[in-house]
């Protein structure tokens, strides 16, 4: 039975040219996290963080994606095309797979405020 929940940074906004941290957190379960996959709105892979093998960064993003902090991702040099959904998929044992969603809006304006965190069951 899957008892865990994924908490994410929710809906966030950031300034064009700036950077943003995409972060998910798995709680309410003792399951072991074996891997976290980060994917974009079109289901293309941004990165993988395997507990033992470390990080895989999709080559198209190697100059703009920094691993971490933790199991999260830092997306740098933001463009307007980065606006959209991002998904964290937690592969766990023995629970199975948990998935969280973040919506990133990249703004032209100089002010970009982060919204409150929210939970996805």
């Amino acid at each position: 039975m899957m008892t865990g929940t994924i908490e994410t940074t929710g809906n966030i906004s950031a300034k064009k040219g700036g950077s943003v941290i995409l972060q998910c957190h798995l709680s309410s379960t003792m399951a072991q996290v074996t891997q976290v996959n980060w994917e974009q709105h079109d289901h293309s892979l941004l990165a993988i963080r395997n507990a033992e093998l470390g990080w895989h960064i999709y080559p198209a993003f190697k100059d703009r994606v920094a691993p971490g902090p933790g199991l999260g991702l830092t997306l740098q040099s933001l463009t307007m095309n980065d606006t959209g959904e991002y998904f964290c998929t937690y592969h766990t044992y023995p629970d199975g797979t948990y998935r969280g969603r973040i919506f990133l809006e990249v703004l032209e304006s100089s002010v970009a405020e982060h919204s409150a965190r929210f939970q996805i069951p």
Partner: antibody, heavy 119, light 107 residues
């Protein structure tokens, strides 16, 4: 030049163990994961597991059910793969391979070690 | 475990031919696919990763494409040194798994 040099061919009895070595050179050993892949005669490739020398992390293909152990000696830049409780189906060529940095692709491979299990 | 199914398992072609090999994953693997080339008695060599980036030194006649579950390796103009067996592999989730291989033979 990146090189992975493996130990020589082995002939083993069923039920015994074999330990294959893989000596790395031409790069910083702790910066790249080492994987082990095997290939039975006339068959395809099968991933056995990997070892991350950066933090001594190991991951195994559960199909081997605890029969495989991957270790390394960082002082000599050498990785090891030990397979126990050998059976005839374990007759294969065993390869070590290095993973590219920040990429789950095996970019350099050892020459292979033939392990024959026969009574 | 994710199954990777390659087709065809073998093909005969002539020098200069355009050759296409396909690989289908049993479930979504995004762009986490790699292609290797192996010649008899030799270790595999990395050709293409992620799944359209050529590894260092790989000729431009080799190209890869696909996403999700369906992937393709194309050799635009087959050369004598290209006769070999080609394998796809997924690293979307462990255990990493390979396709059964496609043997490219001389017609």
């Amino acid at each position: 030049e990146v090189q992975l040099v493996q130990s020589g061919a082995e002939v083993k009895k069923p039920g015994s163990s074999v330990k294959v070595s893989c000596k790395a050179s031409g790069y910083t050993f702790t910066e790249h994961v080492i994987h082990w892949v095997r290939q039975a005669p006339g068959q395809g490739l099968e991933w056995m597991g990997g070892f991350n020398p950066n933090h001594d992390g190991t991951i195994y293909n559960q199909i081997f059910r605890g029969r495989v152990t991957i270790t390394a000696d960082k002082s000599t830049s050498t990785a090891y793969m030990e397979l126990s409780s050998l059976r005839s189906e374990d007759t294969a060529v065993y390869y070590c391979a290095r993973a590219a940095k920040l990429l789950f692709a095996m970019d350099y491979w050892g020459q292979g070690t033939t392990v024959t299990v026969s009574s | 475990d994710i199954q990777m199914t390659q087709s065809p398992s073998s093909l005969s072609a002539s020098v200069g031919d355009r050759v296409t090999i396909t690989c289908r994953a049993s479930q979504h693997v995004s762009n986490a696919v790699v292609w290797y080339q192996q010649k008899p008695g030799k270790a595999p060599k990395l050709l293409i990763y992620s799944p359209s980036y050529r590894f260092t030194g790989v000729p431009s006649r080799f190209s890869g494409s696909g996403s999700g579950t369906d992937f393709t390796l194309t050799i635009s103009s087959l050369q004598p040194e290209d006769f070999a067996t080609y394998y796809c592999q997924q690293h979307y989730s462990t255990p990493w798994t390979f396709g059964g291989g496609t043997k490219v033979e001389i017609k």
